[in-house]
Interface confidence: low
């Protein structure tokens, strides 16, 4: 655990005065309809506020929208709608924000039937001013921006055209018919798929994997016989059709679509899929669906090529196709992940890794609970979380788990602990060291969020009744302060503060209601008077993460290197500040076998360090595919983990015999590519 | 309680190499960095350097770099220090202090300093032909 | 290297009067200082850290002042305990140096 401060609970001094001083009423001239929030840019606490209204007429439904903008973290609002001639907004495009903090916002509008074309407005000054602009095509998407370059602009059509602007949406051109589906690439790069004879849906498995690197002047076809494609890190997938029969395989690229190779991964039929959980620059976690319907597959995790696969995790839970996984990246502490195992009684337990799916093991019993009814033994047993999968059953579970790169080593989680999830009203769990140990946090389910990286942890009971009250922490929940923000108790809708959980504004979203209307209400609340003084230097401590053995050489060694980090005190109440930066020392760890995944043809006996080879391929020489040629392995069984730093120590080595023969199985190869120009 | 224990008094001659240890107990060893620091007879302390039991990374006043080599053993909680190629100069009494604040070497940024906590009882090396 | 020169080299004081002793850095050490007391054959002591924060079990009579450049380390009432050798220690940057003391004797 972290390093904690005595566990009695000390008040925050004056804290009713100071809050009731940086609390804000907003309350929305508005019926209630539904509302969207969005936060443009990083740091300019401008906030637009979209509201949406339908009154059901007898013919058809009548809309009506409203647009507001705050400039200061949600304190005060300003109707805007007249900046968009009053129009009525689609709320299923949402706003589309530019990347970074370029300003940009774009506003999909609700057009007659007869026109010619949809409506966009455009702002590229954090949406102070917009132009209104006709498209010459009507939208199926939302506007994509280019990572790159915030001024192109992507978007399909409802004909299935693919349109580009190189000028934020002033101009449009399209610049392929028979599109799928669409994604920018790195280097301003689309890929897109495309179909030949009827549908996308009914040419599926058919489809053209194209690329164009110069927005549409010249193409590349990079796949074949496509069902569809991916891209994660720096990889990417297609999933194409077998020749022989109905299955098909992943095959990867990493650079662009010029070569590819085949993943060694199952191959899956008709009802199965493919789904990349996470990616990153250095690898992939790839869950395999399982066939029939299972609800099941298996996770792989692959290595630093995306070409062979490591079996993480058995009988991991995806429902089906676009449904439910419990997948979860603890993004305050590397190498962490958590999922949920459908177990052979069709229980649901949730599993945790600290190795990037190296080893998968139970969540820790919180110290300070009971096993509950789930438990064969009252006495062992341990912390299941609640996720999508729970959220989708209507279990009463407001939110999934939180965490946050600079709130170094939370996690926030609804929880319960016994052998398995349970239906009953779960419990907040709170880790302090990235899901090593874990403690209860709050009693019941509520909605929670992290502020000022993690010097204040705010949460709302999560109730069918109005609201009032706010709960706030300024040691990572162990102690508690309730502060009632308003006489007038709310319907409460949610919780809202700026992403990068830097800030130290929160708003609490909700309604009024009376007898004959209800509107939208909002309460900021700025807690930067609860943390009077900037933090210095006295208020952190040093703290190495993935410890487990202070007395081991090796301790906190994971994926090749330990870090240490400079910690806030949970009893220091002080503010980290906008610009605080996570402050951490890496050290290189010795390499062990540990730091070695077993390559292709070799396995790892549960329990055991060593890759031993797959007995059915004892003897063989070991062909796979490579950039469209079979290739001649010659190896002792390892091949170092993605990302994994480690020097010295144990270093298998291998070599890899090149044949140059062709591969049969690789439909992707590059004598099958073939490029042409508009 | 918190302590440092040094290894007792040496007598070498000059061009020969001297190791002295330092056993912590009474706390979490690989917690806090150990600083090295020497007195001359009738002179000032001086920093050599300082170590991190967690890796056991290191870093070196450049006055003795090169001639100093600090290591740790974390199966013993102990610290050591040595100094080769010795002349007579470095006749003194050599400290091991624990410093809690030796991440400010690794993070210059650093605005505070906790100072060196808890000394050892010294080590007293003499160099004479 | 940061220089740290300390003032007067020696200080005699009565017993019950104040003492003051000053340390100058020869460059910004912000308040990453120490202060020591040092008695004949035995180890150094911390006194204060942080440029003025008392040390664990430190009499309350020991103050330390300053950042930045300029720091003071005051002995209110001087017991007779309190004749020592006394030094100043930055950790601004590396290599951390100590001034060259300041010896504290009975008038």
């Known amino acids: 655990s972290a390093p904690g401060e005595d566990e009695e609970c000390g008040r925050v001094r004056d804290f009713v005065a100071k809050l009731a001083n940086n609390t804000h009423q907003h309350v929305f001239d508005d019926l209630r309809g539904s509302v969207s929030l969005s936060w443009v840019g990083d740091s300019t606490g401008v906030i637009l506020v979209l509201t949406t209204f339908h009154v059901p007429l007898v013919i058809m439904t009548f809309g009506q929208s409203k647009l507001y903008r705050s400039e200061d973290y949600g304190k005060n609002f300003k109707d805007i709608t007249d900046l968009i001639n009053n129009t009525f907004i689609r709320t299923e495009f949402g706003m589309a924000i530019g990347p970074e903090n370029s300003g940009k916002v774009v506003l999909t509008a609700e057009v007659s039937g007869g026109s010619r074309g949809g409506r966009i407005f455009r702002s590229s000054d954090f949406a102070k001013n917009f132009v209104q602009t006709d498209l010459p095509f009507h939208p199926l998407t939302q506007m994509m921006y280019s990572p790159q370059n915030s001024d192109y602009l992507l978007a399909l059509s409802t004909e299935n055209g693919l349109w580009v602007s190189k000028n934020f949406g002033g101009k449009w051109e399209e610049i392929h018919k028979a599109v799928c589906l669409a994604k920018w690439g790195s280097d301003n790069t689309i890929f897109f798929t495309t179909y030949a004879n009827g549908s996308c849906k009914a040419d599926l498995g058919a489809l053209e994997l194209w690329r164009t690197s110069d927005l549409g002047k010249s193409f590349k076809t990079i796949g074949v016989k496509i069902y569809s494609f991916g891209l994660g890190g720096r990889f990417l997938f297609a999933s194409v059709m077998a020749d022989k029969d109905t299955t098909r395989r992943i095959h990867v690229s990493t650079d662009q679509g010029d070569t590819w190779s085949m993943a060694q991964l199952p191959s899956v039929g008709q009802e199965q899929f493919y789904s990349i959980l996470a990616a990153n620059d250095d690898m992939v976690f790839m869950h395999v669906d399982e066939p029939g319907d299972t609800g099941f597959g298996t996770i792989f995790t692959s290595d630093d090529r995306g070409i062979v696969y490591s079996k993480s995790l058995d009988r991991h839970l995806y429902t089906t196709t676009g449904g439910e996984t419990d997948f979860t990246n603890v993004t305050s502490l590397r190498g962490v992940y958590i999922t949920s195992v459908l177990s052979e009684d069709n229980s649901i337990q949730t599993m945790i890794t600290f190795d990037q799916g190296g080893r998968w093991t139970h969540l820790r019993k919180p110290e300070n609970s009971e096993c509950d009814a789930t438990a064969k033994n009252k006495n062992e047993c341990s912390l299941h979380i609640h996720a999508s999968y729970s959220i989708s059953q209507k279990l009463n579970v407001p939110m999934a788990p939180l965490s946050e790169p600079n709130a170094v080593g939370i996690v926030i989680a609804h929880g319960s602990v016994g052998d398995a999830i349970s239906v009953m009203v779960p419990d907040v769990y709170i880790s302090d060291d990235g899901g090593y140990s874990w403690t209860k946090m709050l009693e019941g389910p509520h909605y929670y969020t992290i502020l000022d990286s993690g010097g204040i942890i705010v949460a709302i009971e999560h109730s069918s009744r109005p609201i009032n009250v706010i709960k706030f922490s300024t040691d990572e929940g162990q102690c508690w302060q309730t502060y009632t923000f308003t006489r007038d108790p709310i319907y409460f809708t949610g919780l809202a503060s700026e992403p990068g959980a830097r800030s130290m504004n929160i708003s609490i979203w909700g309604f009024t209601e009376s007898f004959l209307t209800s509107q939208w209400v909002s309460y900021t609340i700025d807690f930067k008077d609860i943390l009077e003084r900037n933090c210095e230097e006295k208020d952190y401590t040093i703290w190495l993460a993935h410890s487990t053995d202070p007395e081991d050489y090796e301790d906190g060694c994971i994926l090749g290197y330990k870090e240490q980090f400079l910690r806030l005190r949970k009893s220091s109440v002080c503010q980290n500040g906008r610009d605080y930066v996570v402050t951490k020392q890496p050290s290189i760890c010795l390499c062990s076998l540990e730091d070695f995944l077993c390559d292709f043809g070799y396995y790892r006996p549960e329990n055991d360090s060593k890759c031993v080879e797959q007995p059915e391929l004892k003897g063989h020489d070991l062909e796979f595919c490579l950039y469209g040629r079979e290739e001649h392995l010659t190896t002792n069984g390892y091949r170092k983990i993605p990302g994994d730093k480690c020097q010295g120590g144990v270093n298998p080595v291998r070599e890899v015999k090149d044949l140059k023969k062709k591969c049969t199985s690789n439909f992707l190869s590059p004598e099958k590519q073939n490029s042409k120009s508009n | 309680q918190v302590q440092l224990v040094q290894s007792g008094a040496e007598v070498k001659k000059p061009g020969a190499s001297v190791k002295v240890s330092c056993k912590a107990s009474?706390?979490?060893?690989?917690?806090?960095?150990m600083s090295w620091v020497r007195q001359a007879p009738g002179q000032g302390l001086e920093w050599m350097g300082i170590?991190?039991?967690?890796?056991?990374?290191?870093s070196y006043a450049q006055k003795f770099q090169g001639r100093v080599t600090m290591t740790r053993d974390t199966s013993t909680s102990t610290v050591y220090m040595e100094l080769s190629s010795l002349r007579s100069e470095d006749t003194a009494v050599y400290y091991c202090?624990?410093?809690?604040?030796?991440?400010?070497?690794?993070?210059?940024?650093?605005?505070?300093?906790?100072?060196?906590?808890?000394w050892g009882q010294g080590t007293t090396v003499t160099v004479s032909s | 290297e940061i220089v740290m020169t300390q003032s007067p080299a020696t200080l005699s004081v009565s017993p019950g009067e104040r003492a003051t002793l000053s340390c100058r850095a020869s460059?910004?050490?912000?308040?990453?200082l120490a202060w020591y007391q040092q008695k004949p054959g035995q180890a150094p002591r911390l006194l204060i850290y942080?440029?003025?924060t008392r040390a664990t079990g430190i009499p309350a009579r020991f103050s330390g002042s300053g950042s930045g450049t300029e720091f003071t380390l005051t002995i209110s009432s001087l017991q007779s305990e309190d004749f020592a050798v006394y030094y100043c220690?930055?950790?601004?940057?590396?290599?951390?140096?100590f001034g060259g003391g300041t010896k504290v004797e009975i008038k």
């Open positions: 220690q930055q950790a601004r940057l590396g290599p951390w140096t």
């Open positions: 009474g706390y979490t060893f690989t917690k806090y960095y």
């Open positions: 460059q910004s050490v912000s308040s990453n």
């Open positions: 942080g440029a003025s």
């Open positions: 202090a624990r410093d809690p604040s030796g991440i400010a070497l690794a993070f210059p940024a650093s605005r505070y300093y906790y100072g060196m906590d808890v």
């Open positions: 170590i991190n039991p967690i890796g056991g990374s290191t």
